[in-house]
Interface confidence: low
């Protein structure tokens, strides 16, 4: 009589997560008589995955009817394959009997899935940096299959080239994740710049799956201050402007100092925005010029986003013509009651 | 109460270029993504684009070479620009505001347009 | 693009009993920071869609509470407690995870 075999025609099959995984299993002959049963793995640690005669096994299904007679086909059908169900896989024929004795195991099938990357998740610094310095990115990928896997950084679709990755583990797993950690110097125009992982994987099909982050969120754009004054309609009267440019966030608070005191504190409230996603915010003083004693020099303090304030000074300049319309009389604080101690526009 | 008004021409001739205008009403546009979706009679919804206060735009691919979405912040209105229109394109048009927050995304697309029926014909 | 399928297409309703919508998606809406970028609209006849929930769970402001959504990952179900005759529609889900931003094909609600 012919020696029976147990013929699995496949040495490896590879599925994405998600579909189903045929894997063939044929014996050459009908006897002896006795099961056939599917595991993965072997020895004795192996995980029986489908035994004709008993259990439950929801996701498994025989491709042909086994009760039928003279059937020599038990290869199987598993659906809904997830990462987890790599492995090989055996089919095993045993002899009847009390209990039943493996008789011949097929030559295995490796069961390989692919599984798509998840969603790349770009993080940020988590404190801000000014332009010139540089900041550090991460992209975080998880659970594709096989390991090979590619990564770029795009800054305004200008693909940059500081960057580190690693794909863990480095042995052989079920599924594999990304880290990569991407180095971007900041300049003053980066408030509307993104930075854009890609991950390319065999299972996206050519369609890359990309995490974007926004500069906005690490850049902190200091304020440039200049202060200047500018004559008013009535002769005794002067406008003393702050103009703060160029600031990113917006938070910003200012304050008035009049020879080292404070006169007052405003919150930036309307800001001008520019292309640059930069801001621009003004604050001004009504100064009486009657009203002077020698030698005023009004501050401009600007504490910005938290930092460190940073100012900017102006002496009063009164021409001889403004102090003739002055009487000898004229009395009073420099910053002129006739408007609110400061504007904004 | 923020509202939002379509406006434009209800007809437009094959080969010719459709122009909407979307008026906010009642509300900042900063802070908001702005959002044009159109409704073939008798079909689902589909998204043609939207665009950000600071002016970032975001397209349908399958749209991207025709379409064009612009802001005027100054008069509060947003816009959209179809070119080589055919009779695939008439639909409803719907302007929208979506709703979104840093760390979060988009949170919803929580104000429409009345909406305004565009016929593409000769 | 993400491909969203609801079902089912149509959906009689018996006013007073519960009614349930079921959206999937092609791929998670479930994003790292624990939000599900999933919405459900409706459209009453002759009107512009309106807001219901968003981020999978949340009922937008307004939205009587018989409305509720739930899911994670690519299954997502708007179930209404008690449908009232105000209900009827089509209801949409969409996705906001990625542009372009896609709808579900729709699903009809009508009293039986």
């Known amino acids: 009589e012919e020696e029976l075999q147990v013929i699995q025609p496949e040495k490896s099959v590879s599925v994405t997560a998600g579909e189903s995984a045929t894997l063939n299993c044929t014996v050459t002959s009908l006897i002896p008589v006795g099961p056939i049963q599917w595991f993965r793995g072997a020895g004795p640690g192996r995980e029986l995955i489908y035994n004709l005669k008993e259990g439950h096994f929801p996701r498994v299904t025989t491709v042909l009817d086994p009760t039928k007679r003279n059937n020599m086909d038990f290869s199987i059908h598993i659906s809904n394959i997830t990462p987890a169900d790599a492995g090989t896989y055996y089919c095993v024929k045993f002899r009847k009997g009390s209990p039943d004795v493996e008789l011949k195991s097929g030559a295995g099938t490796e069961l390989s899935v692919r599984a798509k990357p998840s969603a790349p998740v770009v993080s940020g610094p988590t404190a801000r940096a000014t332009p010139e310095h540089t900041v550090s990115f991460t992209c975080e990928s998880h659970g594709f299959s096989p390991r090979d896997i590619t990564l770029k950084w795009f800054k305004n679709g200008n693909e940059l080239s500081d960057f580190q990755t690693n794909v863990d583990p480095a042995g052989k797993s079920v599924s594999y994740s990304i880290r990569s950690t991407a180095r971007v110097v900041l300049t003053r125009r980066d408030v509307h710049s993104q930075v854009i992982c890609e991950v390319a994987h065999v299972t996206l099909q050519g369609d890359p799956l990309r995490g974007t982050a926004n500069l906005s969120e690490a850049i902190r754009v200091p304020p440039t201050l200049e202060v200047f004054q500018r004559p008013m309609r009535a002769e005794n009267q002067v406008n003393v402007t702050c103009q703060v440019r160029k600031f990113y966030p917006q938070r910003l608070l200012l304050t008035w100092l009049e020879n080292g005191n404070v006169s007052q504190t405003e919150t930036a409230s309307t800001l001008t925005e520019n292309k640059d996603g930069t801001y621009n915010w003004r604050s001004w003083l009504l100064v009486n010029t009657c009203a002077h004693r020698d030698g005023v020099v009004l501050t401009c303090q600007v504490e910005h986003d938290g930092q460190p304030a940073v100012s900017k000074s102006h002496a009063l300049e009164v021409s001889a013509h403004q102090k003739e319309q002055c009487s000898d009389t004229t009395s009073g604080p420099v910053l002129a009651p006739t408007a609110p101690l400061g504007g904004s526009g | 109460q923020v509202q939002l008004q379509e406006s434009g021409p209800g007809l437009v001739r094959p080969s010719e270029t459709l122009s909407l205008t979307c008026t906010v009403s009642?509300?900042?546009?900063?802070?908001?993504?702005w959002s044009w979706i159109r409704q073939p009679p008798g079909k689902g919804l589909e998204w043609i684009g939207f665009?950000?206060?600071?002016?970032?735009?975001f397209y349908n691919p399958s749209l991207k070479s025709r379409v064009t979405i612009s802001l005027d912040m100054s008069i509060n209105q947003f816009s959209l620009k179809m070119t080589s229109v055919t009779a695939a394109d008439t639909a409803v048009y719907y302007c929208?505001?979506?709703?979104?927050?840093?760390?979060?995304?988009?949170?919803?697309?929580?104000?429409w347009g009345q909406g305004t029926t565009v016929t593409v014909s000769s | 693009d993400i491909v969203m399928t609801q079902s089912p297409l149509s959906l009689p309703v018996t006013p007073g009993e519960p009614a349930s919508i079921s959206c999937k998606s092609s791929?998670?809406?479930?994003?790292?920071?624990?939000?599900?970028?999933l919405d459900w609209y409706l459209q009453r006849p002759g009107q512009s869609p309106q807001l219901l929930i968003y981020q999978g769970s949340n009922r937008a402001s307004g939205v009587p509470d018989r409305f509720s959504g739930s899911g994670s990952g690519t299954d997502f179900t708007l179930k209404i407690s008690r449908v009232e005759a105000e209900d009827v529609g089509v209801f949409y889900c969409?996705?906001?995870?990625?542009?372009?931003?896609?709808f579900g094909g729709g699903t009809k609600v009508e009293i039986k």
């Open positions: 009642g509300g900042s546009i900063r802070n908001y993504y």
């Open positions: 665009i950000y206060y600071n002016g970032r735009t």
């Open positions: 929208a505001r979506v709703r979104a927050y840093s760390g979060i995304g988009l949170d919803g697309t929580d104000v």
């Open positions: 791929q998670s809406l479930l994003y790292s920071n624990g939000y599900a970028y």
């Open positions: 969409m996705q906001a995870l990625q542009t372009p931003l896609t």
